[in-house]
Protein backbone atom coordinates (compact mmCIF):
# COMPACT_ATOMS: atom_id res chain seq x y z
CA UNK A 1 0.00 0.00 0.00
CA UNK A 2 1.72 3.83 -0.84
CA UNK A 3 0.00 7.12 -0.77
CA UNK A 4 -1.27 8.27 -3.97
CA UNK A 5 -2.35 12.12 -2.13
CA UNK A 6 -3.61 13.11 1.15
CA UNK A 7 -5.76 10.54 2.15
CA UNK A 8 -5.64 8.58 -0.95
CA UNK A 9 -3.75 5.17 -0.82
CA UNK A 10 -3.60 2.77 -3.88
CA UNK A 11 -3.72 -1.25 -2.98
CA UNK A 12 -1.40 -3.74 -5.30
CA UNK A 13 -3.02 -6.69 -5.92
CA UNK A 14 -2.07 -9.33 -7.91
CA UNK A 15 -5.61 -10.18 -9.52
CA UNK A 16 -6.34 -13.87 -9.96
CA UNK A 17 -9.19 -16.37 -9.15
CA UNK A 18 -8.96 -16.53 -5.03
CA UNK A 19 -5.75 -14.60 -4.79
CA UNK A 20 -5.15 -13.66 -0.77
CA UNK A 21 -5.12 -10.10 -1.20
CA UNK A 22 -3.82 -8.02 1.05
CA UNK A 23 -4.06 -7.17 4.74
CA UNK A 24 -4.47 -3.39 5.31
CA UNK A 25 -3.94 -2.02 8.77
CA UNK A 26 -6.17 1.54 9.04
CA UNK A 27 -5.64 3.75 12.02
CA UNK A 28 -7.85 6.57 13.34
CA UNK A 29 -6.18 9.78 13.37
CA UNK A 30 -7.69 10.61 17.50
CA UNK A 31 -6.25 10.60 20.74
CA UNK A 32 -9.31 9.30 21.88
CA UNK A 33 -8.92 4.69 22.34
CA UNK A 34 -12.97 4.20 23.00
CA UNK A 35 -15.83 4.60 21.15
CA UNK A 36 -14.37 4.34 17.63
CA UNK A 37 -16.35 3.26 15.26
CA UNK A 38 -15.66 2.74 11.23
CA UNK A 39 -17.47 2.79 8.18
CA UNK A 40 -17.31 2.06 4.35
CA UNK A 41 -19.04 4.78 2.08
CA UNK A 42 -22.33 5.92 2.62
CA UNK A 43 -23.24 2.49 4.36
CA UNK A 44 -24.12 2.86 7.64
CA UNK A 45 -22.96 -0.61 8.36
CA UNK A 46 -20.28 -0.65 11.20
CA UNK A 47 -17.37 -2.44 10.09
CA UNK A 48 -15.55 -2.77 13.24
CA UNK A 49 -14.42 -0.67 16.29
CA UNK A 50 -11.39 0.66 18.09
CA UNK A 51 -9.01 2.48 16.89
CA UNK A 52 -7.27 0.34 14.14
CA UNK A 53 -9.40 -1.79 11.98
CA UNK A 54 -7.79 -4.04 9.93
CA UNK A 55 -9.14 -5.71 6.29
CA UNK A 56 -8.26 -7.85 4.07
CA UNK A 57 -8.19 -6.19 0.54
CA UNK A 58 -9.23 -8.75 -2.14
CA UNK A 59 -11.72 -6.97 -4.20
CA UNK A 60 -13.24 -3.66 -5.74
CA UNK A 61 -15.87 -4.32 -2.89
CA UNK A 62 -13.35 -3.88 -0.41
CA UNK A 63 -12.08 -0.96 -1.29
CA UNK A 64 -13.69 2.94 -1.36
CA UNK A 65 -13.59 5.74 1.90
CA UNK A 66 -13.00 3.86 5.22
CA UNK A 67 -14.31 6.46 7.80
CA UNK A 68 -13.35 6.66 11.37
CA UNK A 69 -16.50 7.72 13.38
CA UNK A 70 -17.04 8.81 17.46
CA UNK A 71 -20.80 9.77 18.48
CA UNK A 72 -21.25 10.60 15.34
CA UNK A 73 -18.53 12.90 14.45
CA UNK A 74 -15.91 11.96 11.63
CA UNK A 75 -12.65 11.72 12.89
CA UNK A 76 -10.50 11.05 9.68
CA UNK A 77 -10.90 8.71 6.08
CA UNK A 78 -8.85 7.26 4.03
CA UNK A 79 -9.88 6.07 0.14
CA UNK A 80 -8.20 3.15 -0.89
CA UNK A 81 -7.40 2.01 -4.77
CA UNK A 82 -7.08 -1.10 -6.23
CA UNK A 83 -4.17 -1.73 -8.84
CA UNK A 84 -4.31 -4.56 -10.36
CA UNK A 85 -1.53 -6.82 -11.19
CA UNK A 86 -2.60 -9.85 -13.92
CA UNK A 87 0.32 -12.15 -15.08
CA UNK A 88 2.60 -9.87 -13.74
CA UNK A 89 1.64 -6.77 -15.57
CA UNK A 90 -0.01 -4.21 -14.39
CA UNK A 91 -3.81 -3.59 -16.11
CA UNK A 92 -4.20 -0.70 -18.87
CA UNK A 93 -7.99 -1.03 -18.62
CA UNK A 94 -8.62 2.57 -18.40
CA UNK A 95 -6.74 4.09 -21.50
CA UNK A 96 -7.24 2.97 -25.06
CA UNK A 97 -4.06 1.52 -27.22
CA UNK A 98 -3.38 4.08 -29.91
CA UNK A 99 -0.63 1.66 -31.74
CA UNK A 100 1.07 4.47 -33.27
CA UNK A 101 4.27 4.31 -33.78
CA UNK A 102 3.92 0.67 -32.02
CA UNK A 103 1.80 -1.67 -29.86
CA UNK A 104 1.66 -0.65 -26.34
CA UNK A 105 1.53 3.06 -26.82
CA UNK A 106 -1.23 4.84 -24.55
CA UNK A 107 0.33 8.36 -24.58
CA UNK A 108 1.30 10.21 -27.52
CA UNK A 109 3.58 13.48 -27.38
CA UNK A 110 4.26 16.34 -29.96
CA UNK A 111 6.49 19.35 -29.93
CA UNK A 112 6.05 22.57 -32.16
CA UNK A 113 9.10 23.75 -30.95
CA UNK A 114 12.47 23.19 -29.24
CA UNK A 115 11.22 25.42 -26.58
CA UNK A 116 10.60 22.87 -23.91
CA UNK A 117 6.61 23.15 -24.78
CA UNK A 118 5.08 19.43 -25.82
CA UNK A 119 1.88 18.51 -25.42
CA UNK A 120 0.62 14.79 -24.55
CA UNK A 121 -2.86 13.12 -25.36
CA UNK A 122 -4.41 9.58 -24.71
CA UNK A 123 -7.49 8.07 -25.55
CA UNK A 124 -10.59 6.28 -23.47
CA UNK A 125 -13.91 5.07 -24.24
CA UNK A 126 -14.84 5.82 -20.34
CA UNK A 127 -17.07 9.06 -19.72
CA UNK A 128 -17.52 9.22 -16.32
CA UNK A 129 -15.81 9.03 -12.68
CA UNK A 130 -12.47 9.34 -14.32
CA UNK A 131 -9.45 11.63 -13.12
CA UNK A 132 -6.28 11.94 -14.11
CA UNK A 133 -3.10 13.72 -12.66
CA UNK A 134 0.21 13.93 -15.24
CA UNK A 135 3.53 14.45 -13.70
CA UNK A 136 7.05 15.14 -15.45
CA UNK A 137 10.98 15.39 -15.44
CA UNK A 138 13.69 15.02 -17.31
CA UNK A 139 16.00 12.00 -16.31
CA UNK A 140 14.54 9.72 -13.63
CA UNK A 141 17.50 9.32 -11.49
CA UNK A 142 18.31 12.88 -10.80
CA UNK A 143 15.22 14.24 -12.26
CA UNK A 144 15.35 18.51 -13.36
CA UNK A 145 12.25 20.00 -13.26
CA UNK A 146 8.87 19.84 -15.83
CA UNK A 147 5.98 21.85 -15.25
CA UNK A 148 2.15 20.33 -16.11
CA UNK A 149 -1.05 21.97 -16.60
CA UNK A 150 -4.04 19.86 -16.14
CA UNK A 151 -5.55 17.18 -18.09
CA UNK A 152 -8.46 17.92 -19.92
CA UNK A 153 -10.92 16.69 -22.69
CA UNK A 154 -10.20 18.35 -25.54
CA UNK A 155 -12.14 15.93 -28.06
CA UNK A 156 -14.80 13.34 -28.82
CA UNK A 157 -15.43 11.36 -31.13
CA UNK A 158 -17.76 8.80 -32.24
CA UNK A 159 -15.92 5.09 -33.13
CA UNK A 160 -19.03 2.83 -34.88
CA UNK A 161 -21.20 2.27 -31.85
CA UNK A 162 -18.43 3.88 -29.32
CA UNK A 163 -17.56 7.01 -28.07
CA UNK A 164 -13.66 7.98 -27.47
CA UNK A 165 -12.43 10.62 -25.23
CA UNK A 166 -9.56 12.63 -25.88
CA UNK A 167 -7.48 13.92 -22.93
CA UNK A 168 -4.59 16.12 -23.60
CA UNK A 169 -2.06 17.81 -21.74
CA UNK A 170 0.83 20.70 -21.64
CA UNK A 171 3.49 20.42 -20.37
CA UNK A 172 6.43 22.75 -19.99
CA UNK A 173 10.65 22.55 -19.28
CA UNK A 174 11.13 24.79 -16.44
CA UNK A 175 14.86 25.10 -17.95
CA UNK A 176 14.74 24.56 -21.26
CA UNK A 177 17.79 24.96 -23.19
CA UNK A 178 16.73 24.48 -26.95
CA UNK A 179 20.37 24.31 -28.81
CA UNK A 180 21.75 21.49 -26.35
CA UNK A 181 21.74 17.54 -27.93
CA UNK A 182 19.38 16.07 -25.20
CA UNK A 183 21.18 12.99 -23.39
CA UNK A 184 18.33 12.50 -20.59
CA UNK A 185 14.79 11.99 -21.98
CA UNK A 186 11.51 13.39 -21.02
CA UNK A 187 9.43 11.28 -18.78
CA UNK A 188 5.56 11.81 -18.33
CA UNK A 189 4.04 9.65 -15.90
CA UNK A 190 -0.06 9.75 -15.77
CA UNK A 191 -2.31 8.19 -12.79
CA UNK A 192 -5.73 7.51 -13.85
CA UNK A 193 -8.19 6.83 -11.63
CA UNK A 194 -11.72 5.10 -12.49
CA UNK A 195 -14.18 4.85 -9.98
CA UNK A 196 -11.91 2.67 -7.51
CA UNK A 197 -9.04 1.97 -10.13
CA UNK A 198 -5.61 2.74 -10.30
CA UNK A 199 -3.48 2.73 -13.34
CA UNK A 200 -0.27 4.27 -14.32
CA UNK A 201 1.12 5.20 -17.63
CA UNK A 202 4.23 6.37 -18.74
CA UNK A 203 6.28 7.81 -22.30
CA UNK A 204 9.65 8.39 -22.24
CA UNK A 205 11.13 10.71 -25.34
CA UNK A 206 13.52 13.29 -26.44
CA UNK A 207 12.32 16.48 -27.45
CA UNK A 208 13.87 16.32 -31.00
CA UNK A 209 11.74 12.70 -31.82
CA UNK A 210 8.64 13.91 -31.25
CA UNK A 211 8.98 17.39 -32.92
CA UNK A 212 6.25 18.09 -35.75
CA UNK A 213 6.19 21.57 -36.77
CA UNK A 214 3.00 23.43 -37.35
CA UNK A 215 2.45 23.69 -41.59
CA UNK A 216 4.01 26.49 -43.52
CA UNK A 217 2.33 29.62 -43.17
CA UNK A 218 1.53 32.33 -46.10
CA UNK A 219 1.68 29.92 -49.01
CA UNK A 220 1.29 32.07 -51.99
CA UNK A 221 1.23 31.27 -55.80
CA UNK A 222 2.59 33.90 -58.21
CA UNK A 223 2.24 32.66 -62.07
CA UNK A 224 4.98 33.01 -64.47
CA UNK A 225 4.28 35.11 -67.55
CA UNK A 226 4.09 33.32 -70.57
CA UNK A 227 4.09 29.70 -68.81
CA UNK A 228 2.24 27.16 -67.00
CA UNK A 229 5.22 27.73 -64.21
CA UNK A 230 4.09 29.42 -60.79
CA UNK A 231 6.20 30.31 -58.15
CA UNK A 232 4.89 28.88 -54.65
CA UNK A 233 6.06 30.98 -51.70
CA UNK A 234 5.95 30.54 -47.97
CA UNK A 235 6.80 31.45 -44.49
CA UNK A 236 8.20 29.81 -41.85
CA UNK A 237 5.28 28.79 -39.09
CA UNK A 238 5.07 31.53 -36.29
CA UNK A 239 5.37 28.83 -33.78
CA UNK A 240 8.95 27.25 -34.67
CA UNK A 241 11.54 28.19 -33.01
CA UNK A 242 14.18 31.17 -33.58
CA UNK A 243 16.60 32.00 -34.88
CA UNK A 244 15.92 30.21 -38.35
CA UNK A 245 19.21 30.65 -39.66
CA UNK A 246 20.09 28.40 -36.49
CA UNK A 247 16.86 26.39 -36.47
CA UNK A 248 16.28 25.59 -40.01
CA UNK A 249 13.61 23.76 -41.75
CA UNK A 250 13.40 22.28 -45.17
CA UNK A 251 10.29 21.60 -47.30
CA UNK A 252 8.26 18.79 -49.57
CA UNK A 253 5.98 20.87 -52.09
CA UNK A 254 3.51 18.49 -53.97
CA UNK A 255 1.19 19.43 -57.22
CA UNK A 256 -1.76 16.91 -56.58
CA UNK A 257 -4.38 16.55 -59.35
CA UNK A 258 -8.24 16.11 -57.89
CA UNK A 259 -7.77 12.72 -58.50
CA UNK A 260 -5.96 10.63 -55.88
CA UNK A 261 -4.76 8.20 -58.53
CA UNK A 262 -3.28 11.09 -60.51
CA UNK A 263 0.60 11.31 -60.05
CA UNK A 264 1.75 13.28 -57.72
CA UNK A 265 4.35 15.72 -58.41
CA UNK A 266 7.01 16.52 -55.24
CA UNK A 267 10.05 19.18 -54.65
CA UNK A 268 11.93 19.36 -51.63
CA UNK A 269 13.97 22.29 -51.14
CA UNK A 270 15.36 24.19 -48.29
CA UNK A 271 14.28 27.64 -49.54
CA UNK A 272 11.08 29.23 -49.05
CA UNK A 273 9.83 29.30 -52.59
CA UNK A 274 9.64 26.89 -55.49
CA UNK A 275 8.77 27.07 -59.37
CA UNK A 276 6.68 24.59 -60.30
CA UNK A 277 3.53 23.40 -62.82
CA UNK A 278 0.19 24.15 -61.80
CA UNK A 279 -2.09 21.54 -63.95
CA UNK A 280 -5.57 22.65 -64.18
CA UNK A 281 -7.65 21.56 -61.12
CA UNK A 282 -4.76 20.15 -58.63
CA UNK A 283 -3.71 21.90 -55.35
CA UNK A 284 -0.35 22.80 -54.31
CA UNK A 285 0.90 21.89 -51.25
CA UNK A 286 3.85 22.59 -48.84
CA UNK A 287 4.86 20.53 -45.40
CA UNK A 288 8.28 21.11 -43.27
CA UNK A 289 10.08 18.88 -41.31
CA UNK A 290 13.57 20.11 -39.15
CA UNK A 291 16.43 20.45 -41.72
CA UNK A 292 19.02 18.23 -39.79
CA UNK A 293 17.16 16.01 -37.93
CA UNK A 294 14.22 13.52 -39.68
CA UNK A 295 10.99 13.86 -37.15
CA UNK A 296 8.23 14.00 -38.30
CA UNK A 297 6.50 16.41 -41.01
CA UNK A 298 4.45 18.73 -40.68
CA UNK A 299 0.84 18.73 -41.78
CA UNK A 300 0.11 19.82 -45.52
CA UNK A 301 -0.57 23.98 -45.95
CA UNK A 302 -2.85 23.73 -49.44
CA UNK A 303 -3.73 26.20 -52.09
CA UNK A 304 -5.95 25.39 -55.45
CA UNK A 305 -3.90 26.04 -58.78
CA UNK A 306 -6.45 27.99 -60.39
CA UNK B 1 39.45 26.84 -40.85
CA UNK B 2 39.57 27.03 -36.52
CA UNK B 3 42.74 27.68 -35.05
CA UNK B 4 42.57 26.71 -31.21
CA UNK B 5 43.81 30.02 -31.03
CA UNK B 6 40.55 31.28 -32.30
CA UNK B 7 40.67 32.30 -35.80
CA UNK B 8 37.33 31.64 -38.01
CA UNK B 9 36.81 28.27 -39.78
CA UNK B 10 35.52 27.84 -43.16
CA UNK B 11 31.79 28.27 -42.27
CA UNK B 12 30.27 27.49 -45.66
CA UNK B 13 32.21 24.06 -45.73
CA UNK B 14 31.80 23.43 -42.68
CA UNK B 15 27.83 23.97 -43.43
CA UNK B 16 28.27 21.79 -46.56
CA UNK B 17 30.10 19.16 -45.15
CA UNK B 18 27.89 19.05 -41.40
CA UNK B 19 24.51 18.73 -43.80
CA UNK B 20 25.89 16.27 -45.82
CA UNK B 21 26.67 14.03 -42.34
CA UNK B 22 23.22 14.59 -41.22
CA UNK B 23 21.69 12.81 -44.46
CA UNK B 24 24.49 9.99 -44.29
CA UNK B 25 23.94 9.23 -40.50
CA UNK B 26 20.26 9.04 -41.12
CA UNK B 27 20.74 6.93 -44.20
CA UNK B 28 23.00 4.69 -42.50
CA UNK B 29 20.07 4.14 -39.64
CA UNK B 30 17.01 5.15 -40.99
CA UNK B 31 14.13 5.43 -38.11
CA UNK B 32 13.29 1.79 -38.52
CA UNK B 33 9.48 0.66 -37.77
CA UNK B 34 10.46 3.81 -34.88
CA UNK B 35 13.12 1.12 -33.25
CA UNK B 36 13.38 1.89 -29.06
CA UNK B 37 16.98 1.48 -28.43
CA UNK B 38 16.37 3.19 -25.25
CA UNK B 39 14.88 -0.02 -23.11
CA UNK B 40 17.77 -1.98 -23.52
CA UNK B 41 19.55 -0.07 -21.54
CA UNK B 42 22.25 1.92 -23.16
CA UNK B 43 24.18 3.30 -20.12
CA UNK B 44 27.05 1.84 -21.01
CA UNK B 45 27.05 3.03 -24.53
CA UNK B 46 25.96 6.89 -24.75
CA UNK B 47 26.65 7.98 -21.46
CA UNK B 48 30.20 8.31 -22.36
CA UNK B 49 29.39 10.19 -25.67
CA UNK B 50 30.51 13.59 -25.81
CA UNK B 51 26.94 15.84 -25.62
CA UNK B 52 26.86 19.22 -26.52
CA UNK B 53 25.57 20.77 -23.71
CA UNK B 54 23.59 23.80 -22.04
CA UNK B 55 27.15 25.79 -21.18
CA UNK B 56 29.26 24.27 -24.49
CA UNK B 57 28.71 27.94 -25.83
CA UNK B 58 26.52 26.25 -29.21
CA UNK B 59 23.71 28.63 -28.57
CA UNK B 60 23.49 31.61 -31.37
CA UNK B 61 24.11 33.68 -28.87
CA UNK B 62 27.47 31.82 -27.59
CA UNK B 63 28.47 31.61 -30.80
CA UNK B 64 28.24 35.29 -31.06
CA UNK B 65 30.35 35.64 -28.17
CA UNK B 66 33.02 33.21 -28.72
CA UNK B 67 32.72 30.45 -31.17
CA UNK B 68 35.58 28.58 -30.22
CA UNK B 69 33.81 26.53 -27.17
CA UNK B 70 31.53 25.08 -29.03
CA UNK B 71 33.50 24.03 -32.03
CA UNK B 72 36.02 22.42 -29.82
CA UNK B 73 33.36 20.64 -28.43
CA UNK B 74 32.29 19.89 -31.82
CA UNK B 75 35.77 18.68 -32.87
CA UNK B 76 35.52 16.55 -29.91
CA UNK B 77 32.73 14.83 -30.76
CA UNK B 78 33.54 14.45 -34.07
CA UNK B 79 37.14 12.45 -33.40
CA UNK B 80 34.79 10.36 -30.75
CA UNK B 81 32.76 8.91 -33.18
CA UNK B 82 35.29 8.47 -36.06
CA UNK B 83 36.91 6.49 -33.63
CA UNK B 84 33.63 4.47 -32.91
CA UNK B 85 33.08 3.76 -36.56
CA UNK B 86 36.43 2.44 -37.22
CA UNK B 87 36.35 0.17 -34.28
CA UNK B 88 35.35 -3.36 -34.22
CA UNK B 89 31.84 -2.24 -33.42
CA UNK B 90 31.73 -1.32 -37.05
CA UNK B 91 34.38 -3.51 -38.44
CA UNK B 92 33.58 -6.83 -37.08
CA UNK B 93 30.89 -9.34 -37.77
CA UNK B 94 28.65 -9.02 -39.10
CA UNK B 95 29.46 -7.22 -41.65
CA UNK B 96 28.58 -4.14 -43.40
CA UNK B 97 27.19 -4.52 -46.64
CA UNK B 98 29.79 -3.03 -49.45
CA UNK B 99 27.27 -0.21 -50.23
CA UNK B 100 26.79 0.98 -47.00
CA UNK B 101 27.02 4.75 -45.54
CA UNK B 102 28.84 4.30 -42.58
CA UNK B 103 31.74 4.61 -44.61
CA UNK B 104 31.24 7.62 -46.13
CA UNK B 105 30.54 8.50 -42.44
CA UNK B 106 33.63 8.10 -41.68
CA UNK B 107 35.43 9.72 -43.96
CA UNK B 108 32.86 12.72 -43.95
CA UNK B 109 33.33 13.10 -39.61
CA UNK B 110 37.04 12.62 -40.61
CA UNK B 111 37.05 15.38 -42.98
CA UNK B 112 34.77 17.84 -40.95
CA UNK B 113 37.17 17.52 -37.87
CA UNK B 114 40.12 18.27 -40.12
CA UNK B 115 38.63 21.30 -41.42
CA UNK B 116 38.11 22.29 -37.73
CA UNK B 117 41.62 21.26 -36.60
CA UNK B 118 43.99 21.94 -39.05
CA UNK B 119 47.51 19.17 -39.16
CA UNK B 120 49.90 20.71 -35.86
CA UNK B 121 47.08 22.23 -33.88
CA UNK B 122 45.76 20.22 -30.81
CA UNK B 123 42.71 20.47 -29.12
CA UNK B 124 41.92 18.02 -26.15
CA UNK B 125 40.12 14.70 -26.88
CA UNK B 126 37.67 12.48 -25.32
CA UNK B 127 38.96 9.11 -24.07
CA UNK B 128 36.89 6.25 -26.16
CA UNK B 129 35.30 4.28 -23.61
CA UNK B 130 36.48 0.51 -24.43
CA UNK B 131 33.24 -1.06 -25.82
CA UNK B 132 34.31 -4.34 -27.27
CA UNK B 133 31.09 -6.56 -27.18
CA UNK B 134 31.63 -10.00 -28.00
CA UNK B 135 28.05 -11.28 -29.50
CA UNK B 136 27.33 -10.51 -33.10
CA UNK B 137 23.95 -9.04 -32.02
CA UNK B 138 25.22 -6.97 -29.29
CA UNK B 139 27.63 -5.30 -31.96
CA UNK B 140 24.53 -4.98 -34.21
CA UNK B 141 22.17 -3.15 -31.08
CA UNK B 142 25.78 -1.00 -30.94
CA UNK B 143 25.76 0.20 -34.03
CA UNK B 144 22.50 1.30 -33.65
CA UNK B 145 22.55 3.23 -30.60
CA UNK B 146 25.73 5.00 -31.67
CA UNK B 147 24.04 6.20 -34.58
CA UNK B 148 20.90 7.26 -33.42
CA UNK B 149 23.12 9.13 -30.92
CA UNK B 150 24.94 10.62 -33.68
CA UNK B 151 22.00 11.55 -35.29
CA UNK B 152 21.45 13.81 -32.81
CA UNK B 153 25.09 15.38 -32.06
CA UNK B 154 25.42 16.00 -35.80
CA UNK B 155 22.10 17.85 -36.13
CA UNK B 156 23.39 20.44 -33.76
CA UNK B 157 26.66 20.50 -35.44
CA UNK B 158 25.23 21.31 -38.52
CA UNK B 159 22.55 23.87 -36.26
CA UNK B 160 25.80 25.50 -35.60
CA UNK B 161 27.52 25.88 -38.61
CA UNK B 162 24.39 26.82 -41.02
CA UNK B 163 23.81 29.85 -38.25
CA UNK B 164 27.74 30.20 -38.24
CA UNK B 165 27.37 30.81 -42.41
CA UNK B 166 24.76 32.90 -42.29
CA UNK B 167 26.05 35.37 -39.74
CA UNK B 168 29.63 35.35 -39.02
CA UNK B 169 31.26 34.43 -42.39
CA UNK B 170 33.95 37.49 -42.85
CA UNK C 1 -4.02 30.35 3.44
CA UNK C 2 -3.17 29.47 7.06
CA UNK C 3 -1.80 32.00 9.32
CA UNK C 4 -0.22 31.26 12.65
CA UNK C 5 0.93 33.35 15.75
CA UNK C 6 2.62 31.48 18.81
CA UNK C 7 2.52 32.72 22.03
CA UNK C 8 3.17 31.61 25.62
CA UNK C 9 7.21 32.32 25.30
CA UNK C 10 9.17 34.01 27.52
CA UNK C 11 11.73 33.61 30.20
CA UNK C 12 11.85 31.07 32.69
CA UNK C 13 14.34 29.31 35.54
CA UNK C 14 16.17 26.11 34.97
CA UNK C 15 13.76 23.13 35.75
CA UNK C 16 10.68 25.67 35.46
CA UNK C 17 7.80 24.92 32.75
CA UNK C 18 6.20 27.18 29.99
CA UNK C 19 3.09 26.47 27.56
CA UNK C 20 3.54 27.73 24.16
CA UNK C 21 -0.05 28.05 21.85
CA UNK C 22 -0.15 28.33 18.09
CA UNK C 23 -3.41 29.65 16.94
CA UNK C 24 -4.18 29.34 13.19
CA UNK C 25 -6.28 31.37 11.43
CA UNK C 26 -7.59 31.04 7.45
CA UNK C 27 -8.13 27.66 6.04
CA UNK C 28 -9.43 24.74 8.41
CA UNK C 29 -6.65 24.04 10.80
CA UNK C 30 -7.80 20.85 11.28
CA UNK C 31 -6.81 19.61 7.71
CA UNK C 32 -2.71 20.14 8.31
CA UNK C 33 -0.43 18.34 10.19
CA UNK C 34 1.61 21.03 13.01
CA UNK C 35 5.11 21.22 14.16
CA UNK C 36 7.25 23.00 16.57
CA UNK C 37 10.68 23.98 16.03
CA UNK C 38 13.50 26.18 17.64
CA UNK C 39 16.20 27.57 15.83
CA UNK C 40 19.30 29.53 17.63
CA UNK C 41 20.61 32.17 15.69
CA UNK C 42 23.28 31.34 13.08
CA UNK C 43 22.09 27.64 13.36
CA UNK C 44 19.73 25.50 11.45
CA UNK C 45 16.08 25.10 12.43
CA UNK C 46 15.78 22.29 14.43
CA UNK C 47 12.88 19.92 15.37
CA UNK C 48 11.35 19.39 18.19
CA UNK C 49 7.61 17.70 17.58
CA UNK C 50 4.62 17.01 15.13
CA UNK C 51 1.30 16.28 15.75
CA UNK C 52 -1.08 14.56 13.05
CA UNK C 53 -3.83 16.01 12.01
CA UNK C 54 -6.48 14.39 14.11
CA UNK C 55 -4.05 14.28 17.45
CA UNK C 56 -3.68 10.44 16.89
CA UNK C 57 0.16 10.38 16.39
CA UNK C 58 2.73 12.20 17.74
CA UNK C 59 6.38 12.59 17.27
CA UNK C 60 9.79 14.21 19.45
CA UNK C 61 13.46 14.89 18.93
CA UNK C 62 15.36 12.67 21.55
CA UNK C 63 16.23 15.64 23.29
CA UNK C 64 12.94 16.70 24.42
CA UNK C 65 11.62 13.31 25.15
CA UNK C 66 9.91 13.25 28.09
CA UNK C 67 10.12 16.67 28.89
CA UNK C 68 7.34 18.05 26.10
CA UNK C 69 3.98 17.16 25.19
CA UNK C 70 1.99 18.50 21.63
CA UNK C 71 -1.45 18.33 21.76
CA UNK C 72 -4.19 20.00 19.39
CA UNK C 73 -7.20 21.07 19.79
CA UNK C 74 -9.20 21.79 16.14
CA UNK C 75 -12.15 23.19 17.36
CA UNK C 76 -10.33 26.00 18.58
CA UNK C 77 -7.46 26.19 15.94
CA UNK C 78 -4.69 25.68 18.47
CA UNK C 79 -1.93 23.44 19.10
CA UNK C 80 -0.04 23.42 22.10
CA UNK C 81 3.41 22.46 23.43
CA UNK C 82 3.82 21.83 26.87
CA UNK C 83 7.55 22.21 28.33
CA UNK C 84 8.54 20.66 31.54
CA UNK C 85 12.03 20.31 32.96
CA UNK C 86 12.97 23.59 30.79
CA UNK C 87 17.53 23.43 30.36
CA UNK C 88 19.36 26.33 29.43
CA UNK C 89 19.68 23.96 25.93
CA UNK C 90 16.16 24.58 25.35
CA UNK C 91 17.07 28.29 24.78
CA UNK C 92 15.82 29.64 21.12
CA UNK C 93 13.46 31.01 19.16
CA UNK C 94 10.29 28.49 19.01
CA UNK C 95 8.55 28.42 15.52
CA UNK C 96 4.85 27.18 14.96
CA UNK C 97 4.39 25.10 11.26
CA UNK C 98 1.57 23.81 9.41
CA UNK C 99 2.24 20.42 6.76
CA UNK C 100 -0.58 19.67 3.98
CA UNK C 101 -0.07 15.69 4.26
CA UNK C 102 -3.06 12.85 5.27
CA UNK C 103 -4.51 11.80 8.50
CA UNK C 104 -2.29 10.34 10.98
CA UNK C 105 0.58 11.46 8.91
CA UNK C 106 3.40 13.42 11.12
CA UNK C 107 6.86 14.56 9.96
CA UNK C 108 10.05 16.18 10.90
CA UNK C 109 10.96 17.73 8.13
CA UNK C 110 10.99 21.52 7.60
CA UNK C 111 10.49 21.03 3.87
CA UNK C 112 7.22 19.48 3.87
CA UNK C 113 5.58 22.25 6.37
CA UNK C 114 4.08 25.07 3.98
CA UNK C 115 3.10 27.51 6.73
CA UNK C 116 5.15 28.96 9.42
CA UNK C 117 5.00 31.21 12.24
CA UNK C 118 7.08 34.57 13.23
CA UNK C 119 8.15 32.63 16.44
CA UNK C 120 8.21 33.48 20.26
CA UNK C 121 11.73 33.34 22.07
CA UNK C 122 12.50 30.89 25.08
CA UNK C 123 14.94 31.88 27.24
CA UNK C 124 15.93 29.62 30.29
CA UNK C 125 18.08 30.61 32.90
CA UNK C 126 20.45 28.46 35.26
Known amino acids: IWELKKDVYVVELDWYPDAPGEMVVLTCDTPEEDGITWTLDQSSEVLGSGKTLTIQVKEFGDAGQYTCHKGGEVLSHSLLLLHKKEDGIWSTDILKDQKEPKNKTFLRCEAKNYSGRFTCWWLTTISTDLTFSVKSSRGSSDPQGVTCGAATLSAERVRGDNKEYEYSVECQEDSACPAAEESLPIEVMVDAVHKLKYENYTSSFFIRDIIKPDPPKNLQLKPLKNSRQVEVSWEYPDTWSTPHSYFSLTFCVQVQGKSKREKKDRVFTDKTSATVICRKNASISVRAQDRYYSSSWSEWASVPCS | RAVPGGSSPAWTQCQQLSQKLCTLAWSAHPLVGHMDLREEGDEETTNDVPHIQCGDGCDPQGLRDNSQFCLQRIHQGLIFYEKLLGSDIFTGEPSLLPDSPVGQLHASLLGLSQLLQPEGHHWETQQIPSLSPSQPWQRLLLRFKILRSLQAFVAVAARVFAHGAATLSP | EVQLVESGGGLVQAGGSLRLSCAAS????????AGWFRQDPGEEREFVST????????GYADAVKGRFTISRDNAKNTVYLQMNNLKPEDTAVYYC???????????????????WGQGTQVTVSS
Open chain 3, 97 to 115: AAADVSYGTTTDDPKRYDY
Open chain 3, 26 to 33: GRTFSTYA
Open chain 3, 51 to 58: ISRGGGTT
